[in-house]
Every structure is written in structure tokens, then in C-alpha cells.
């Protein structure tokens, strides 16, 4: 595929990445799949600046990110190392709370109303943010 050099229509460029901000809600898995179909992934927050940028665009609304612990340890969807990376959890989070009565714990991370992170039930229909890196090979065939 060809190298993507600018962001698609309706995506926002920031620091060599493109971001798309949903205005509807989906379960985490559906949001993850939506981003993949766009040749992207749920947003991976790797720095203070990226946190601030995303927070600025989503406002005070619960919004999924590309972080989960559905298979045990916390993992970013693009393979970025969780342990050594940027974190912005709310105090006492993540807590894998079982008291919601929906079965199981809380395995998916989202931005809360103040931008800090919380783990929640993955089935909740939250907004989401997709991210794709510029300079990475696109799956689309090159234009002739």
C-alpha cells in the first residue's frame, strides 16, 4: 500500500497522527472493530500532550480508548508497553469493580468527564476515538 501523508476528511491531525472523534456510542469491541475497518485503532495515549489533545476534543464525556485487560494484564491495542508508558487513572482506579450487576468485572478503559481514566464494563455504549499514524502504509491501493 501507499504511505499516508495527510489525514482523511473529518479526521484531525496532531503530531503525525490522525484522530477521528465519534459522536455516537458503541460497546468497546464494536468501537475497536469500527476503527480497524478504518485502517486505524482505538486511541493509544502515549504522552501528556496527547492526553491533553484528546481531552480538548472529547470534552467532559465518557469515551473509550484502546486500553483493556480482557486477557489479564492491561494492554494497549497497538502493542505500546503499558507498564512503562503514560498513565492517567483516576484515584483508586482501575478497580475491576464487580458491583455493577452486569456480570464480570471492568476490563475496558475510558476517559471520564475530567479526562482521567477509569475501567468500566466493556458493553457500555460510550463514544470512542480512532487513531492512525501518518507515514504508515495504508491498506488502500495507490492512486494511479
Amino acid at each position: 500500500g501507499s504511505e499516508r501523508t495527510c489525514c482523511p476528511v473529518n479526521w484531525v491531525e496532531h503530531e503525525r497522527s490522525c484522530y477521528w472523534f465519534s459522536r455516537s456510542g458503541k460497546a468497546w469491541a464494536d468501537a475497536d472493530n469500527y476503527c480497524r475497518l478504518e485502517d486505524a485503532h482505538l486511541v493509544v495515549v502515549t504522552s501528556w500532550e496527547e492526553q491533553k489533545f484528546v481531552q480538548h476534543h472529547i470534552g467532559p464525556v465518557n469515551t473509550w480508548m484502546g486500553l483493556h485487560d480482557q486477557n489479564g494484564p492491561w494492554k494497549w491495542v497497538d502493542g505500546t508497553d503499558y507498564e512503562t508508558g503514560f498513565k492517567n487513572w483516576r484515584p483508586e482506579q482501575p478497580d475491576d469493580w464487580y458491583g455493577h450487576g452486569l456480570g464480570g468485572g471492568e476490563d475496558c478503559a475510558h476517559f471520564t468527564d475530567d479526562g482521567r481514566w477509569n475501567d468500566d464494563v466493556c458493553q457500555r455504549p460510550y463514544r470512542w476515538v480512532c487513531e492512525t499514524e501518518l507515514d504508515k502504509a495504508s491498506q488502500e491501493p495507490p492512486l494511479l
Epitope: 500532550e49 492526553q51 491533553k52 498513565k87 492517567n88
Partner: antibody, heavy 118, light 107 residues
Framework: QVQLVESGGGVVQPGRSLRLSCAAS????????MHWVRQTPGKGLEWVAV????????YYADSVKGRFTISRDNSKNTLYLQMNSLRAEDTAVYYC???????????WGQGTLVTVSS | DIQMTQSPSSLSASVGDRITITCRAS??????LNWYQQKPGKAPKLLIY???SFQSGVPSRFSGSGSGTDFTLTISSLQPDDFATYYC?????????FGGGTKVEIK
């Protein structure tokens, strides 16, 4: 009301070490990030370092990186700044400040003066 | 690092005057700009955060505006208690940086 009280300042020779403390009260210390900010006499403000509420992230100004270490003891409601290899240009009033919204200082201590001089 | 440039560095004004202090960032900081007031021998006090939000207890004569690189702090009717030094500060990116300050003096 929220109170932050710094201590540990004083006169120290260049190359020596000093540890500042900041005792917090009247809020849930373990729920807030904390900063150190300094002000040279008669001059402006310079951010020094920040530590997350749980210690998971720390950031430093380039001017102190590798020499200063920020830490906290949530069980004692206390913030620390270990200052090694002190230089004359580290002379300043050092304030601790509570973090609100990732990088906003909503409450400040009264400051403690550090003088680095031979 | 993001440089914050404040102007003017000092100004003289009278009680009742409307004054404006400007702050310019060397790159976009979105709306992540805070304003502080400092009196001699005292710690700074937060007035405005994220460019235009009032800290609790701050009088309504103080207001902030701007986004991107250009920001302003306005005092609509200067009061005796307002004679102090004012600093802007960006919280978008570490290292967090302050403007050089604006000293507001009595004319």
C-alpha cells in the same frame, strides 16, 4: 481549608544535597498530583517537577533532571524533593503546589527558601 | 519547550480602570492556559484555568479569553486589592512554563 507547608530549606554549599518536604492537610492527599515550583528572588516562576497521585508518572524540568528527585509518601500526606549536586542557580523559594486538571496549580504552600552559596 | 511571552511587563493604572494583559505561546496550547496573581511575599493564587474558567472565589471582574497561541486576562474595574503581579502558565506540555509576569502598579 487546604494547607501545604514546606520545610527543609536553608543555606547549603554548591555540590551538596538538601531534601525539602511538603506536609499536606485538609484534603485527600493520595487523590492529587503534586508539583514543586520555584521562584528566584525578585524573578519569575519556574516549574520544577510533578508526581502523579499514585507515583505512576513523574516529570522534571531539564534544568534539574538527573539531580532532583520528586517523591511522596501518601501514608504520611507528605511530598518530597531530594536535591543533589546543588548549584548557585538553584537558589530560590521552593513552593509545593497541588495539581488540578493535569498541570494547573490550584493551591500553593507558603514556600521555603533554599540558598546555595559557598 | 513552549515559551510564554507576557506583555506588558508592567503597567500603571488607577482604581476603576479596565486593564488587559496578554500572553502569547510559542506554539498552540489549545485552551490550556492558566492565570495567577501574586502579591509580594506571598505564594501565587490561581485565578483562571483552561483560558476562561474561574477558580472558585475569584471576583467576576476578572475574565480570561483566547485559544491556540493568544490569550488575554482582563480586569474590568481595577480594585485596590488587584495591584499585584500576574503570571500566565501553559499546562499543555511539560516542561510547564510561565510568562515573565506583569506587574500592575498604582498610577
Amino acid at each position: 481549608q487546604v494547607q501545604l507547608v514546606e520545610s527543609g530549606g536553608g543555606v547549603v554549599q554548591p555540590g551538596r544535597s538538601l531534601r525539602l518536604s511538603c506536609a499536606a492537610s485538609a484534603f485527600t492527599f493520595s487523590s492529587y498530583g503534586m508539583h514543586w515550583v520555584r521562584q528566584t528572588p525578585g524573578k519569575g516562576l519556574e516549574w520544577v517537577a510533578v508526581i502523579w497521585h499514585d507515583g505512576s508518572n513523574k516529570y522534571y524540568a531539564d534544568s534539574v533532571k538527573g539531580r532532583f528527585t520528586i517523591s511522596r509518601d501518601n501514608s504520611k500526606n507528605t511530598l518530597y524533593l531530594q536535591m543533589n549536586s546543588l548549584r548557585a542557580e538553584d537558589t530560590a523559594v521552593y513552593y509545593c503546589a497541588r495539581d488540578e486538571q493535569l498541570g494547573t496549580f490550584d493551591y500553593w504552600g507558603q514556600g521555603t527558601l533554599v540558598t546555595v552559596s559557598s | 519547550d513552549i515559551q510564554m511571552t507576557q506583555s506588558p511587563s508592567s503597567l500603571s493604572a488607577s482604581v476603576g480602570d479596565r486593564i488587559t494583559i496578554t500572553c502569547r505561546a510559542s506554539q498552540s496550547i489549545l485552551s490550556y492556559l492558566n492565570w495567577y496573581q501574586q502579591k509580594p511575599g506571598k505564594a501565587p493564587k490561581l485565578l483562571i484555568y483552561v483560558a476562561s474558567s474561574f477558580q472558585s472565589g475569584v471576583p467576576s471582574r476578572f475574565s480570561g479569553s483566547g485559544s491556540g497561541t493568544d490569550f488575554t486576562l482582563t480586569i474590568s474595574s481595577l480594585q485596590p486589592d488587584d495591584f499585584a503581579t500576574y503570571y500566565c502558565q501553559q499546562s499543555y506540555s511539560p516542561p510547564l512554563t510561565f510568562g515573565g509576569g506583569t506587574k500592575v502598579e498604582i498610577k
